[in-house]
Interface confidence: low
């Protein structure tokens, strides 16, 4: 499943490009193991935001079917419970270029120790 | 064609540099607040067309207070399951907005 | 008012190559997304793919090494392309567009291929 | 691929009886992303229920559907002379899309 998310992402890369979207979002770049949990849900949700921004069918269909796929894989895990991580809200907010490409490599860790 | 005034956003300011049709403008938190993960401080000028009268959308952003600050006073660690992310649309449109299949 | 029409041809010989053309219109191929869909006589419904509005296509795997969607977005048309026909893909192909949670809320009226020598 | 079982492949009922329609699915199909369909001979389907419950634009209000995971209901109240057709459940949890065999509901 992770690696169908990691395509949805290439996705609306490609989709994004022919747009405008300025939004800064909350993203985590040096993610510790023992906050990945927390750190992936924090890209999921900032996700929504590039889907309501865009207004594109598109990229919303795309969004929809990564957090699906995501919360797909992370319920198979089991319930791993993380403590003393950062909400989102305390993160950097970076530019959509950078927020992908750091959900890229945080979707690669997951893959790596599955 | 231009919008008027947009809405007010609990514990957020908007500096609108535009009021024509199809601009598109930010509405910022106030200091001590953040923007909640997940909802967008955008505002666009769109026209109702029943109407032919300007508007602006609203904006999906709650600005919470800055978790930082709240940190600072003693406090358990903030704890997370792996309960997964609900999608927030609940209709057919991008928008969340259930208005029959059309975009505005 | 949202349409959708197919068009092609009505017999295709068996190994040769099927060109559908979906004409639509009351909505844009840039922002929706069109989905072929198809279904032998008698039977049920089967997905072969989806053309996205900015272009990408998602495939059914059963179908891929063979399928291709491709748009013109000016003339508001979406093409399928299908190599090496056989009798087993007489159906009636249907496009349909594309609203959230992959669903199809406006379909176009059909047009049955035959495939026969 | 999610494999999506309809029952009973034929319902004969009479107008104003209430119609059941089972939809199964092999795998869990995540928040309930499954889709009803009525199709009449000689036209294109046309969808009635999306998201599992929620009733599609200009569909009468004696269509409604329910369920979740991997079991999935339509139910028709009462049935006009119009309802009887032959219905389609479709998933979109994955990849690829998948339809249902079909229930046909006919005049008893």
């Known amino acids: 499943n992770w690696v169908n998310v990691i395509s949805d992402l290439k996705k609306i890369e490609d989709l994004i490009q022919s747009m405008h979207i300025d939004a800064t979002l909350y993203t985590e770049s040096d993610v510790h193991p023992s906050c990945k949990v927390t750190a992936m849900k924090c890209f999921l949700l900032e996700l929504q935001v590039i889907s309501l921004e865009s207004g594109d069918a598109s990229i919303h269909d795309t969004v929809e079917n990564l957090i699906i796929l995501a919360n797909n894989s992370l319920s198979s895990n089991g319930n791993v419970t993380e403590s003393g991580c950062k909400e989102c809200e305390e993160l950097e907010e970076k530019n959509i270029k950078e927020f992908l490409q750091s959900f890229v490599h945080i979707v690669q860790m997951f893959i790596n120790t599955s | 064609i231009t919008c008027p005034p947009p809405m007010s956003v609990e514990h957020a300011d908007i500096w609108v540099k535009s009021y024509s049709l199809y601009s598109r403008e930010r509405y910022i938190c106030n200091s001590g607040f953040k923007r909640k993960a997940g909802t967008s401080s955008l505002t666009e000028c769109v026209l109702n067309k029943a109407t032919n009268v300007a508007h602006w959308t609203t904006p999906s952003l709650k600005c919470i207070r800055d978790p930082a600050l709240v940190h600072q006073r003693p406090a358990p660690p903030s704890t997370v399951t792996t309960a997964g992310v609900t999608p927030q649309p609940e209709s057919l449109s991008p928008s969340g907005k259930e208005h029959h299949h059309h975009h505005h | 008012q949202v349409t959708l029409k197919e068009s092609g041809p009505v017999l295709v010989k068996p190994t040769e190559t099927l060109t559908l053309t979906c004409t639509v219109s009351?909505?844009?191929?840039?922002?929706?997304?069109v989905h072929w869909i198809r279904q032998p006589p008698g039977k049920a419904l089967e997905w072969l793919g989806v053309?996205?509005?900015?272009?990408?296509?998602d495939y059914n795997p059963s179908f891929m090494s063979r399928l291709t969607i491709s748009k013109d977005t000016s003339k508001s048309q979406v093409v399928l392309t299908m190599t090496n026909m056989d009798p087993v893909d007489t159906a009636t192909y249907y496009c349909?567009?594309?609203?959230?949670?992959?669903?199809?809320?406006?379909w176009g009226q059909g047009t049955t291929v035959t495939v026969s020598s | 691929e999610i494999v999506l079982t309809q029952s009973p492949g034929t319902l004969s009922l009479s107008p104003g009886e209430r119609a059941t329609l089972s939809c199964r699915a092999s795998?869990?199909?995540?928040?309930?992303?499954l889709a009803w369909y009525q199709q009449k001979p000689g036209q294109a389907p046309r969808l009635l229920i999306y998201?599992?419950?929620k009733l599609a634009s200009g569909i009468p209000d004696r269509f409604s559907g329910s369920g979740s995971g991997t079991d999935f209901t339509l139910t028709i109240s009462r049935l006009e002379p119009e309802d009887f057709a032959v219905y389609y459940c479709q998933q979109r949890a994955s990849y690829p899309l998948t339809f249902g065999q079909g229930t046909k509901v006919e005049i008893k």
């Open positions: 349909a567009k594309n609203a959230a949670y992959y669903v199809m809320d406006y």
């Open positions: 795998q869990s199909v995540i928040y309930s992303y």
């Open positions: 009351g909505f844009s191929l840039t922002t929706y997304a």
């Open positions: 998201a599992a419950s």
């Open positions: 053309i996205w509005g900015a272009g990408s296509t």
